[in-house]
Amino acid sequence: PPKDLVVTEVTEETVNLAWDNEMRVTEYLVVYTPTHEGGLEMQFRVPGDQTSTIIQELEPGVEYFIRVFAILENKKSIPVSARVATYLPAPEGLKFKSIKETSVEVEWDPLDIAFETWEIIFRNMNKEDEGEITKSLRRPETSYRQTGLAPGQEYEISLHIVKNNTRGPGLKRVTTTRLDAPSQIEVKDVTDTTALITWFKPLAEIDGIELTYGIKDVPGDRTTIDLTEDENQYSIGNLKPDTEYEVSLISRRGDMSSNPAKETFTTGLDAPRNLRRVSQTDNSITLEWRNGKAAIDSYRIKYAPISGGDHAEVDVPKSQQATTKTTLTGLRPGTEYGIGVSAVKEDKESNPATINAATELDTPKDLQVSETAETSLTLLWKTPLAKFDRYRLNYSLPTGQWVGVQLPRNTTSYVLRGLEPGQEYNVLLTAEKGRHKSKPARVKASTEQAP
């Protein structure tokens, strides 16, 4: 009988055999059968002067029971035997169909052999302790999308076929998931010229963040700011009022970059500038301001006495000139008002430009001379509407000099004494509050002639 049957080489479809024999025989009979149930027995003969052969056209990944008999004059010897499995082939054509931040989709070529499943393994090469993700797929499948991966990580993907609980050799490819962009972008504290951009840092390890912004409808005009990986907010300035802006954030690492995360916002209306009081009367205040840059519908003026009281509101059209002027009427005399002027466009309103301005004290009413004598004049008047501190009563002397008398605010009459007979006197009565003075009430009167 043959001795020392050796399997010298195995491939996916062939098995090389060699054996020893001390004596010359007519031929050898090679019999091979798959070990699985229902396997078909096959055989072929080898000339007696050969001690090796190749079994061909085997099925990949199948275990065979092989026997070699020596035949001499039509008699079969006891066989030598061996068990050997053909190799499973490695898959081919593994390609990346899509690579995203947390998913990778792969595809590969079909295999025209019998096997049970594909096995695909994803291994994070940056985090060895993370473990592998293994997925089994039924045979007709030739693509797979793995989700739940970490952004910006290097993954090794290996593809095998499995037959009879045996995993074939793997076809390996390496890829890196895309960097994720900063998330949850918010635009806060938007004014007419500034905005604060905030975001959550990406999950991927990155070198830095690129923030780009510009007017939405002007794609070419963009400003780019390079930020460190630790930053999570940035304040943009020098923006145009009432303009829609687009801001985008990109994560960067080396030559990798994430998809942009985008947000749009519209700057506020700019407030009127250089608001000033032009003039005032006892019941009106005239205001003027420089118009803002934004195209607006009108200006809204809100005003109220600073000491408290109802507030009023009036809308005035924007002037075609560089400034707009308006007069608030029906105001209380001697009253300081807090005034705010804001720009209005549809449902938007700018921050107000503010100013405090006071109406003048109103003039004491109905100043008259009720009685004349040789050396005195009796004066009467009615109290002004404004709250005030005191009166100043001035009268001229025949010499051209003026004498003033300070009177308490509850006074409504006063006798000028020590005058000269038969002289004309000019009398001026003014209400005062702090440094503010009303326009004077005036009266002319003459003392009686001496007899």
Epitope: G400, Q401, W402, V403, G404
Partner: nanobody
Framework: QVQLVETGGGLAQAGGSLRLSCAAS????????MGWFRQAPGKEREFVAA????????YYDYTVQGRFTISKDNAKNTVNLQMNSLKPEDTAVYYC????????FGDGYEMDYWGDGTQVTVSS
């Protein structure tokens, strides 16, 4: 800097007279108005009288008009307050004050310079 020094204060009988003077030194007060305020114990400071730089225009509180006369001597940079027919309610510390305009005299908030004061006491 301007120093204002008041003199002439003291004790007087009701119906009597006193003459206060205020001398300004340190710089010329050309164009300034000068005047007097007073403060009685426990009361607010109040205006008494003032005179324009030219001396042509005067201003008095109604409580003193006809009794007090204000005058000034520009050559000496002084202002005087002649107080006649004194009453016990005239008892106070009298302060000299200087401002750019006669109009500023009234509430006393806008004075440029103040003296340290001189006591006037009127007994009944």
């Amino acid at each position: 800097q301007v120093q204002l020094v008041e003199t002439g204060g003291g004790l007087a009988q009701a119906g009597g007279s006193l003459r206060l003077s205020c001398a300004a030194s340190g710089r010329t007060l050309s164009g300034y108005a000068m005047g007097w305020f007073r403060q009685a114990p426990g009361k607010e400071r109040e205006f008494v009288a003032a005179i324009s730089w030219s001396g042509r225009n005067t201003y008095y509180d109604y409580t003193v008009q006809g009794r007090f006369t204000i005058s000034k001597d520009n050559a000496k940079n002084t202002v005087n307050l002649q107080m006649n027919s004194l009453k016990p309610e005239d008892t106070a510390v009298y302060y000299c004050a200087v401002s750019r305009s006669l109009d500023e005299f009234g509430d006393g908030y806008e004075m440029d310079y103040w003296g340290d004061g001189t006591q006037v006491t009127v007994s009944s």
